[in-house]
Interface confidence: low
């Protein structure tokens, strides 16, 4: 059952070429651009993180004996994944709250590479997607999702971890990026902006969308998240942009209607199981893919990012609820929880469809500048 409230086909970048980002962070950086310090989003910055880093929010991996077969997405330990240290890409804030976890914030000090050196790596996320420069790769087959339609029971944990709202997923949600590229879903979370300020992490030709959903997966080749961190293809994230539409999105409403219960940082509630696939676009065949990193500390690299071409539609009220209900630590609203786009540094974004041909209204005679690498290489 797919949501009817999605654009039938909404090419990313259609009609959005060169649109200025309200935060002034995205100046359509070229692939050669060096990392830049993230501009502090403002007084609503999100302070530290407690539980999981985002997709990133990877789980602290519990001993298997604690709950056999269950992948826990709790606090991801700070891991120093390999990477070439560069100038700071993001700022972070460290403090201690009774444990040894690193705490960080968007737009604060010290820089994220001091929290985790991997944050200064060369192949970081998010990135600006330029359909014209994407390499059409016919080997990228439609994504396969199995077991994503969950029954109401058992209920799922919905948590405000101080830097996002995260839904922990039960075992059994399987996803395949292609033959032999199989993953298990662990958790999903969202990134958003503030009133009148979009907050997606990825951008398309410099255009930032209102919000973005990330569904984080662990490769079946690994039993634990900490084993997969920094390993090519160890983690995979499905990402979709959320846009404003005329109707309420019933699937998202099942989560958004519960946000007030977890408005406080660190709080959580239980929600009935739902159709997780209904939170994603209905077209699993058209997407962009590249290798990047977690977008929050520990910023581990080797993450396979799949960004849907189709967007998901939420009502204006729903987008407002998302951006205006939750609170982070220190009496600050949980808003603008996205990282600045990072340089590609030579990476090629692949497309499962000829994006350069049909997704940008600017190119009358598109030229494919990049060649496709065989999927899975």
């Amino acid at each position: 059952q797919r949501l009817p409230r999605m654009q039938e086909d909404s090419p990313l970048g259609g009609g959005s070429s060169g649109e200025d980002d309200p935060l002034g962070e995205e100046d359509l950086p070229s692939e050669e651009d060096s990392p830049r310090e993230e501009d502090p989003p403002g007084e609503e910055d999100l302070p530290g993180e407690e539980d999981l880093p985002g997709e990133e929010d990877l789980p602290e991996v519990k001993p298997k004996s604690e709950e056999e077969g269950s992948l826990k997405l709790e606090d991801l330990p700070t891991v120093e994944a390999p990477g070439d240290p560069q100038e700071p890409q993001n700022n972070a804030h460290r403090d201690k709250e009774g444990d040894d976890q690193s705490h960080w914030r968007y737009g604060g000090d010290p820089p994220w590479p001091r929290v985790s050196p991997a944050c200064a790596g060369r192949f970081q996320s998010p990135v600006d997607i330029r359909p014209q420069l994407a390499a059409f790769c016919p080997a990228l087959r439609p994504l396969e999702l199995l077991g994503f339609q969950l029954p109401p029971l058992p209920e799922l944990r919905l948590r405000n971890n101080g830097h996002s709202v995260q839904l922990t997923l039960p075992p059994g949600l399987e996803m395949a990026l292609g033959p032999g590229r199989e993953y298990r879903a662990l958790q999903l979370h969202l990134h958003w902006g503030a009133a009148g300020r979009p907050g997606s992490e990825h951008t398309v030709e410099g255009h930032r969308f209102p919000a973005e959903i990330h569904v984080v997966h662990l490769s079946t080749a690994f039993a634990r998240v900490d084993e997969a961190l920094g390993r090519p293809g160890g983690l995979a994230v499905l990402a979709a942009f959320l846009e404003e539409g005329p109707e309420e999105n019933s699937a998202y409403e099942q989560l958004l209607s519960r946000l007030e219960e977890i408005a406080e940082e660190g709080s959580e509630t239980q929600v009935p199981g739902l159709d997780i696939s209904a939170l994603l676009p209905s077209d699993f065949s058209r997407y962009f893919q590249y290798e990047g990193s977690l977008t929050t500390p520990p910023c581990a690299q080797g993450v396979i990012w799949t960004v849907f071409n189709q967007t998901v539609m939420l009502s204006a009220k729903q987008l407002h609820t998302l951006s205006d209900t939750l609170w982070g630590p220190g009496d600050s609203r949980l808003q603008l929880n996205f990282r600045a786009t990072q340089p590609l540094n030579g990476r090629v974004i692949e497309a499962s469809f000829p994006a350069g041909v049909d997704s940008s209204p600017r190119a009358a005679e598109p030229v494919q500048l990049n060649s496709c690498l065989a999927a899975g290489d």
């Epitope: 405000n160 519960r258 007030e260 219960e261 977890i262 408005a263 406080e264 940082e265 660190g266 709080s267 959580e268 509630t269 239980q270 209900t325 939750l326 609170w327 009496d331």
Partner: antibody
Framework: EVQLLESGGGLVQPGGSLRLSCAAS????????MTWVRQAPGKGLEWVGI???????WYADSVKGRFTISRDNSKNTLYLQMNSLRAEDTAVYYC???????????????WGQGTLVTVSS | DIQMTQSPSFLSASVGDRVTITCQAS???????LSWYQQKPGKAPKLLIY???NLPSGVPSRFSGSGSGTDFTLTISSLQCEDFATYYC????????????FGGGTKVEIK
């Protein structure tokens, strides 16, 4: 320093009405859930009701339909309108602020000093 | 409705003693829905523990909270003179039908 000051308590006959106020200083109440709690003489604490930061309200079964919680953000004041009062409503009434902004979680700090409501004929 | 059963109701202890108070919920609740309060005669309650295990600033570290699901505990590691008071747990769940309730209280008296 955040302070909450209740007022409006007193003696009222059964079936009567009373409106309690809780004035806040040192903080903007509009960002916080606020709760009312009462304590009958010599008894324990009893939760009465709560208003969320989005002005949704929930009540204990014992007062549902009789009590109404509201707030006036311009006055930074919380209210408890009590109608159809009964003898068992006699108690010290406390208002309290959610310890953190936004949500409904059960952590309240600080509390007002309380105001005594006596329902008797 | 949810019920919070607190025990013991009364507790006699001496300065320096380790004191443990338990609170049992009639149904599973999230740790973020459980807090503990201290009340002295004629005074308003004071928040001691929130989210089951967290101490607000200004609360002495001899107070600690633990537990999850239905069983929660407040521990005073070394009782001080100023700790003789009544302690209440507050637990519940914030859902479409928000419900919360206090435990019956535990009065800690000087032995």
């Amino acid at each position: 320093e955040v302070q909450l000051l209740e007022s409006g308590g007193g003696l009222v006959q059964p079936g009567g009405s009373l409106r309690l106020s809780c004035a806040a200083s040192g903080i903007d109440l509009s960002n916080y859930a606020m709760t009312w709690v009462r304590q009958a003489p010599g008894k324990g604490l009893e939760w009465v009701g709560i208003i969320s930061s989005n002005d949704k309200t929930w009540y204990a079964d014992s007062v549902k339909g009789r009590f109404t919680i509201s707030r006036d953000n311009s006055k930074n004041t919380l209210y408890l309108q009590m109608n159809s009062l009964r003898a068992e409503d006699t108690a010290v009434y406390y208002c309290a602020k959610a310890a953190m902004p936004g949500g409904l979680k059960n952590a309240f700090d600080p509390w007002g000093q309380g105001t005594l409501v006596t329902v008797s004929s | 409705d949810i019920q919070m059963t607190q025990s013991p109701s009364f507790l006699s202890a001496s300065v320096g003693d380790r004191v443990t108070i338990t609170c049992q919920a009639s149904q599973t609740i999230g740790g973020s829905d459980l807090s503990w309060y201290q009340q002295k005669p004629g005074k308003a309650p004071k928040l001691l523990i929130y989210y089951a295990t967290n101490l607000p600033s200004g609360v002495p570290s001899r107070f600690s909270g633990s537990g999850s699901g239905t069983d929660f505990t407040l521990t005073i590691s070394s009782l001080q003179c100023e700790d003789f008071a009544t302690y209440y747990c507050l637990g519940g769940y914030a859902a479409a039908s928000y419900r919360t309730a206090f435990g019956g209280g535990t009065k800690v008296e000087i032995k």
